[in-house]
């Protein structure tokens, strides 16, 4: 599942190349292992902003698929309460390119621990 | 064809650079507030084909209290007082419903 999430992220990266989306998105660039589910929640929430602002059906579908995949992968530990983690709104806002790069890194973190 | 002034969003302001069709503008959350993750500050001037009237799209933006400020512990009461001055809580700017800045 996580491997498919990476391929969806690559697809989103390719699709937004031709678009001008100037949004800045809350980005956790240094994820602590004890806060990875909380960080993933922020990435998934902010991914929806890309979908909303692109107005593109392919991006919309890919974002929804990615969220479905991540949700199912996290259904076992999605309700784990991580304490002492930053809320999404406390994170630094970064451009879409940096956001997607950091997103790939956190997914790889999940791949390495699954 | 141009758009009218955009709608108000609670705890946010907007400085419109262009009212022309297809113009994309962003709301900014007021000081002490942050854009809620997953919501978009973007609004676009679009044409309603049925009525031929331009309007701004409704942003999904929600501005919430900055969690960094919410989490801050109040400083312990000071033993030194300044005569004649009563410390006031920092007042937040209006919600955005009361005022808008529309720059042409």
């Amino acid at each position: 599942n996580w491997v498919n999430v990476i391929s969806d992220l690559k697809k989103i990266e390719d699709l937004i190349q031709s678009m001008h989306i100037d949004a800045t998105l809350y980005t956790e660039s240094d994820v602590h292992p004890s806060c990875k589910v909380t960080a993933m929640k922020c990435f998934l929430l902010e991914l929806q902003v890309i979908s909303l602002e692109s107005g593109d059906a392919s991006i919309h579908d890919t974002v929804e698929n990615l969220i479905i995949l991540a949700n199912n992968s996290l259904s076992s530990n999605g309700n784990v309460t991580e304490s002492g983690c930053k809320e999404c709104e406390e994170l630094e806002e970064k451009n879409i390119k940096e956001f997607l790069q950091s997103f790939v890194h956190i997914v790889q973190m999940f791949i390495n621990t699954s | 064809i141009t758009c009218p002034p955009p709608m108000s969003v609670e705890h946010a302001d907007i400085w419109v650079k262009s009212y022309s069709l297809y113009s994309r503008e962003r709301y900014i959350c007021n000081s002490g507030f942050k854009r809620k993750a997953g919501t978009s500050s973007l609004t676009e001037c679009v044409l309603n084909k049925a009525t031929n009237v331009a309007h701004w799209t409704t942003p999904s933006l929600k501005c919430i209290r900055d969690p960094a400020l919410v989490h801050q512990r109040p400083a312990p009461p000071s033993t030194v007082t300044t005569a004649g001055v009563t410390p006031q809580p920092e007042s937040l700017s209006p919600s955005g419903k009361e005022h808008h800045h529309h720059h042409h």
């Epitope: 589910v37 909303l52 579908d61 929804e64 698929n65 991540a70 949700n71 259904s75 999605g78 | 997953g38």
Partner: antibody
């Protein structure tokens, strides 16, 4: 008024195939994900398949995975369900339903067709 | 898979009286983004299902306000404040937070 009309149901032998169609009208078909839901005679509802707006992504429960294929033709405003290797337990009324997007309003099947009956029997 | 369990399976109600249907999921259906995709569908005799409530408590357009949804986590409830004759039918809860999406077994509401 949103309209969804299923067709293609009928009697088929076990191991056989059938293709259901769902004609959509009065809404922009390509803007919505679509689903198939079935109901065995006198029983409850069972989700069968979902397809994304553009048709690139499909989702199935294990009970039909590998046997059923959901697809769509946005130029014809039509949803399909190709059913292969049919079994007696696939006997049901098959409904197509329009699915509201997660990103714009939370998942939900807001409009349903009248259903088409599929009977698998020798 | 998430198993949805409804109770009661049969609910005889007097016209004008309230009715309450419970739906319990085998695990929390709060998704990673904090949303709970829980719907309620009504199926009148001989008809197709119809959406009543989405995301736990949001009434779909055209649904009378005597219908209300509540709950969180694993426990959800559909309430009808005053049952009318047209409310007769089977009510299903449905989760689409996690694939495979699953329905409850249904609760048959009938008039006493």
């Amino acid at each position: 008024e949103v309209q969804l009309v299923e067709s293609g149901g009928g009697l088929v032998q076990p191991g056989g195939s059938l293709r259901l169609s769902c004609a959509a009208s009065e809404f922009t078909f390509s803007n919505y994900a679509m689903s198939w839901v079935r109901q065995a005679p006198g029983k409850g509802l069972e989700w069968v398949a979902t397809i994304s707006r553009g048709g690139d992504y499909t989702y199935y429960p294990d009970s039909v995975k590998g046997r059923f294929t959901i697809s769509r033709d946005n130029s014809k405003n039509t949803l399909y369900l190709q059913m292969n290797s049919l079994r007696a337990e696939d006997t049901a009324v098959y409904y197509c339903a329009r699915r509201v997007s997660m990103i714009t309003g939370g998942w939900a099947m807001d409009y349903w067709g009248q259903g088409t009956l599929v009977t698998v029997s020798s | 898979d998430v198993v949805m369990t409804q109770s009661p399976l049969s609910l005889p109600v007097t016209l004008g009286q309230p009715a309450s249907i419970s739906c319990r999921s085998s695990q929390s259906i709060v998704d990673i983004t904090g949303n709970t995709y829980l719907e309620w569908y009504q199926q009148r005799p001989g008809q197709s299902p119809r959406l009543l409530i989405y995301k736990v408590f949001n009434r779909f357009s055209g649904v009378p306000d005597r219908f209300s949804g509540s709950g969180s986590g694993t426990d959800f409830t559909l309430k009808i404040s005053r049952v009318e004759a047209e409310d007769v039918g089977v009510y299903y809860c449905f989760q689409d937070s996690f694939v495979p999406y699953t329905f409850g077994q249904g609760t048959k509401l009938e008039i006493k």
